[in-house]
């Protein structure tokens, strides 16, 4: 149990203890949510105190202060998803339709996702807000007819499901055109060819 002497400058529990070189002893770190209010000596272990409101320490530490909680900066496109507690800093994420454009240990600046042009859609990512859109072509039998960061390719309409017949096939950028079976085809669409 700390404090105890250490000649090789290492402690038995690296996570919860630290080496104090002045006295050449191992002392307890303070648990998350606390800070060092009195340093250890040969006869007394570290004394810890709880972080004040609006401050935190996330890890076992031997800090003499707690870190100040920072709000998510909406000007930078960030929004809060979990508040600051004594043990954890504020958790932020990019707004929907934005991605993290600047990273310094955590996201500091979000920017609008770029549009995917007609005939493409944004490749789905596991984590929202992590990177800009990567646009991929609609798969066969699907279309997407807008420029948008969020539009998804939709399946072409099946005319027969509606009791209609196909007048023009769908493309990657447009849906199938259907017509009533009783409607006559315009001359340019007619299968009859006069010689």
């Amino acid at each position: 149990v700390p404090p105890y002497g250490s000649e090789n400058q290492t402690c038995r529990d690296q996570e919860k203890e630290y080496y104090e070189p002045r006295h050449r002893i191992c002392c307890s770190r303070c648990p998350p949510g606390t800070y060092v209010s009195a340093k250890c000596s040969r006869s007394r272990d570290t004394v810890c105190a709880t972080c004040a409101e609006n401050s935190y320490n996330e890890h076992w530490n031997y800090l003499t202060i707690c870190q100040l909680c920072r709000p998510c900066d909406p000007v930078m496109g960030l929004e809060e998803i979990a508040p600051c507690t004594s043990k954890r800093k504020t958790q932020c994420r990019c707004q929907p339709g934005m991605f993290c454009a600047a990273w310094a240990l955590e996201c500091t600046h979000c920017e609008l996702l770029s549009d995917c042009p007609p005939g493409t859609e944004a490749e789905l990512k596991d984590e929202v807000g992590k990177g800009n859109n990567h646009c991929v072509p609609c798969k066969a039998g699907h279309f997407q007819n807008t420029s948008s960061p969020s539009a998804r390719c939709q399946p072409h309409t099946r005319c027969e499901d509606q009791g209609l017949v196909e007048a023009a096939p769908g493309t990657a950028q447009s849906d199938t055109t259907c017509r009533n079976p009783s409607e006559s085809l315009p001359p340019e669409m007619s299968g009859t060819m006069l010689m």
Epitope: P74, V75, G77, E79, E80, I81, A82, P83, Q91, Q95, P96, G97, M98, L112, L113, V128, P149, S150
Partner: antibody
Framework: EVQLLESGGGLVQPGGSLRLSCAAS????????MTWVRQAPGKGLEWIGV???????YYTDSVKGRFTMSRDNSKNTLYLQVNSLRAEDTAVYYC????????WGQGTTVTVSS | DIQMTQSPSSLSASVGDRVTITCQAS??????LSWYQQKPGKAPKRLIF???SLESGVPSRFSGSGSGTDFTLTISSLQPEDFATYYC?????????FGGGTKLEIK
């Protein structure tokens, strides 16, 4: 204090349209994403969509192509244009701050009936 | 979409009772869960977010716990003003989804 005030609801025939508004105060509206949620009579809550501070929109499948969200940051106002209304769109429509819907307005009622 | 299953759908209890409502997500949502209280004719009011963080002004008899897929809202000692409908909501995904609601009635 954050306040949201919806308006524009009413009785409309099937196939009809309405434009719902949400006036925001007490926070810097232009910085925040905004969310629309609805609640059919006696039913639970259904997310309609979200619009980010730059105007980018995401919708639930059941309203895609019929509902359009927009915003006027200079007027601190959010809009929901609802077209091709159906009986199942009858609900109280709420706007809420941020994509997490932390603060809600009091709602505006849309009734679709012939 | 992430499905949220809330239970029970209704609950009868008396003033002073301890009440627990549960919510289960169809996939892991970390701690990105809110609890709302809704009274008849009123808008939902957020009580708890990030699974366990109490909104300012919400009485301390309300508490939330859980992470991943299983979450709980507890009211330690029911007060007359607590009889209402309670909803859970996930915001791990931008497309929010809500539990079906729990109607808390006076026994």
């Amino acid at each position: 204090e954050v306040q949201l005030l919806e308006s524009g609801g009413g009785l409309v025939q099937p196939g009809g349209s309405l434009r719902l508004s949400c006036a925001a105060s007490g926070f810097t509206f232009s910085y925040y994403a905004m969310t629309w949620v609805r609640q059919a009579p006696g039913k639970g809550l259904e997310w309609i969509g979200v619009i980010n501070s730059g105007g980018g929109t995401y919708y639930t499948d059941s309203v895609k192509g019929r509902f359009t969200m927009s915003r006027d940051n200079s007027k601190n106002t959010l809009y929901l244009q609802v077209n091709s209304l159906r009986a199942e769109d009858t609900a109280v429509y709420y706007c809420a701050k941020a994509s997490t819907a932390d603060v809600w307005g009091q709602g505006t009622t849309v009734t679709v009936s012939s | 979409d992430i499905q949220m299953t809330q239970s029970p759908s209704s609950l009868s209890a008396s003033v002073g009772d301890r009440v627990t409502i549960t919510c289960q997500a169809s996939q892991g949502i970390s701690n990105y869960l809110s609890w709302y209280q809704q009274k008849p004719g009123k808008a939902p009011k957020r009580l708890i977010f990030a699974a366990s963080s109490l909104e300012s002004g919400v009485p301390s008899r309300f508490s939330g716990s859980g992470s991943g897929t299983d979450f709980t809202l507890t009211i330690s000692s029911l007060q007359p003003e607590d009889f209402a409908t309670y909803y859970c909501q996930q915001y791990n995904s931008y497309s929010l989804t809500f539990g079906g609601g729990t109607k808390l009635e006076i026994k």
